[in-house]
């Protein structure tokens, strides 16, 4: 299927010409900005994103890596290293320290340095680190959190939360022993410790007592609140706040975005992590595009500008799984939204920023030609004489042994939603990796994003392009469009 | 998730034609790709036609200039409309969905339960 054109050198000088002349185009921003987005997917490695490139191109009926990815599109490109300070392949807390609070921390920590020791609540007074968008809110700015997990999970709660084990969700996640010493559950932190204007994503059960019924499942008890200390966390949220609403399903969600009197709007759309983007029901659920969609709406009624937080978490659980097809449709939304985040806001007082906390053992190989399905099968046979798909896992559960050898497998399997791909080694849940992950950058001062750095750059790229502790002053022109 | 269901299958002599129809449930339809597929007795399942998110369309060699895709997005169906059939066509015939023509052609992600066709002679 190889297209006449490419055939041609003409072809590869031309293209190649317009990206170098495009390329020297590129003037470095010397102004401030005004807003931050920081777009997180979550496990997104480099494999993730060339994959979703294929697959999303496949979907738009071409052959694949010919059509960039909304992401792709953005001029500065850094690599980002990941490690935990505890931990050479890192975990989606500690990473979310890093990118988001500008320090790295210790494996399942959150918001914390590394002088705080996982699951040891004694270690966490005096260790806090304070998040980008602590620092943006104290600004002035408006600032959200969007997500398609919990909002109460690891990468989301690095905005906020300052936690010595991050799956502390609710009270009845904390030992009674760390309740005593004065831990709060992440949920508790997400409405106490700072004033978010914005709040969409799952994780409704932990905002409310147990027993509670959930809206969406009544009769499933085990959907319902999950509170022991008999509170009812989004009640106090809405009592603390003139002009907050609370909604959990997409036309409330889409209303609510709409109305001016709207200051404050938290979403919880499920009790646990949301749907994936194939299991949605888009009567019922906002995508992730449509999420992101209505924070900016809100967002951008700030004349001193805003931070969001977006993530593609689910990215991340489809790969856990070994399912391919769900890590990359899951990167594929939140592509989408990055898209649709590009076309509501400027560059010229918008920085935006992609990565990934982490990598995962997911691998693209096997020589198949060019315009075959990403879900497809490798050319050849392997050793054994069996097939063998492009899209593999080092480890997981995808290993899987029939009468004591691999699996053959087919492409009317390999293509099912289902599908698990194989892996080397038998695990419960495929793992995390350690390589480096991409960053990619535009607006003002997305130059800066360049070279391999630390993780924890990031947050200072952010900090420093808005001016906000501790590079308030940066000695930057104020943001386009402004003249204070 | 996608539900597929196929209908319009049956007996018919050499030489002539049937529609198949295939319903699918789910509210994006328009976003997939679709493509029919068949399996003869004691034979594997073979390509038969897809038809793409964007209109494009691709058959198998074996029924170029017979067989006829196409779509109706508002219906979310789509038809294979097959002429001057062989008894070579006698197949139980599937409808398929995925992501993009390249996909659903190679690796579909969702199956109907299909429906037979037999062409006697």
């Known amino acids: 299927i190889i297209p006449v054109e490419e055939e041609n050198p003409d072809f590869w000088n031309r293209e190649a010409a317009e990206a170098l002349g495009a390329a020297k185009k590129l003037q470095p921003a010397q102004t401030a900005a005004k807003n931050l987005i920081i777009f997180l997917g979550d496990g997104m490695g480099v494999s993730t994103v060339t994959a979703a490139r294929i697959l999303k191109g496949q979907k738009k009926d071409k052959l694949g890596p010919e059509i960039p990815l909304a992401m792709d599109r953005f001029p500065y490109v850094a690599l980002s290293k990941t490690y935990n300070v505890d931990k050479h392949v890192p975990d989606s807390g500690a990473t979310a320290t890093a990118y988001l609070c500008g320090v790295k921390g210790n494996f399942q920590t959150i918001g914390l340095s590394a002088a705080a020791r996982f699951n040891q609540c004694n270690t966490t007074r005096g260790n806090e680190v304070i998040s980008v968008m602590n620092r943006a809110k104290k600004a002035g700015k408006s600032v959200g959190v969007v997500t398609t997990t919990r909002v109460q999970h690891a990468s989301p709660a690095g905005t906020y939360a300052h936690t010595v084990n991050r799956n502390w969700y609710s009270d009845a996640d904390v030992p009674a022993s760390a309740r005593q010493e004065g831990c709060q559950d992440i949920a508790t932190q997400l409405i106490s410790n700072m004033d978010i204007d914005v709040i969409l994503g799952g994780g409704r059960k932990y905002m409310f007592r147990m027993g509670t019924p959930d809206p969406e499942y009544p009769d499933d008890y085990s959907q319902g609140g999950t509170r022991l200390d008999g509170k009812n966390l989004v009640q106090e949220w809405l009592a603390k706040r003139q002009g907050a609403r609370y909604v959990w399903n997409r036309t409330e969600l889409m209303q609510a975005s709409l109305d001016p009197s709207v200051t404050h709007l938290m979403g919880l759309f499920e009790p646990g992590d949301m749907k994936y983007e194939i299991h949605r029901d888009s009567t019922l659920d906002p995508s992730l595009m449509e999420m992101t969609e209505a924070a900016l709406r809100l967002l951008s009624r700030n004349p001193r500008g805003f931070f969001l937080f977006v993530e593609g978490g689910r990215i991340d659980h489809g790969h856990h799984e070994s399912r391919a097809y769900r890590a990359l449709t899951e990167t594929i939304m939140f592509d989408d939204a990055i898209e649709r985040a590009g076309q509501l806001t400027s560059e010229e007082d918008t920085l935006s920023l992609v990565t990934a906390d982490h990598s995962h053992v997911f691998s693209f190989g096997g020589y198949p030609l060019r315009g075959s399905s990403i879900f497809g099968l490798a050319p050849g046979k392997a050793r054994d004489r069996k097939a063998y798909t492009v899209l593999l896992y080092g480890n997981g559960p995808g290993y899987v042994l029939k009468d004591g050898a691999r699996p053959d497998v087919t492409e009317s399997e390999s293509g099912s939603p289902e599908y698990r791909q194989q892996s080397a080694v038998p695990l419960d849940e495929e793992t995390h990796a350690g390589e480096d992950v991409a960053v990619f950058a535009r607006g003002p001062q997305a130059h800066l994003v360049h070279g391999v750095q630390e993780q924890t750059f990031i947050a200072h790229v952010m900090a420093f392009a808005a001016c906000l502790e501790p590079y308030t002053a940066c000695d930057l022109a104020p943001p386009a469009g402004t003249t204070d | 998730q996608v539900q597929l269901v196929e209908s319009g299958g049956g007996l018919v002599q050499a030489g002539g034609s049937l529609r198949l129809s295939c319903a699918a449930s789910?509210?994006?339809?328009?976003?997939?790709?679709m493509g029919w597929f068949r399996q003869a007795p004691g034979k594997e399942r073979e390509f038969v036609a897809a038809i793409g998110w964007s209109g494009v369309i691709e058959y198998a060699d074996s029924v170029k200039g017979r067989f006829t895709i196409s779509r109706d997005n508002a219906k979310d169906t789509v038809y294979l409309q097959m002429n001057s059939l062989k008894p070579e066509d006698t197949a139980v015939y599937y409808c398929?969905?995925?992501?993009?023509?390249?996909?659903?052609?190679?690796?579909?992600?969702?199956w109907g339960q299909g429906t037979q066709v037999t062409v006697s002679s």
């Open positions: 398929a969905a995925g992501l993009g023509i390249r996909v659903v052609s190679q690796t579909p992600a969702y």
């Open positions: 789910r509210r994006s339809f328009s976003e997939y790709a």
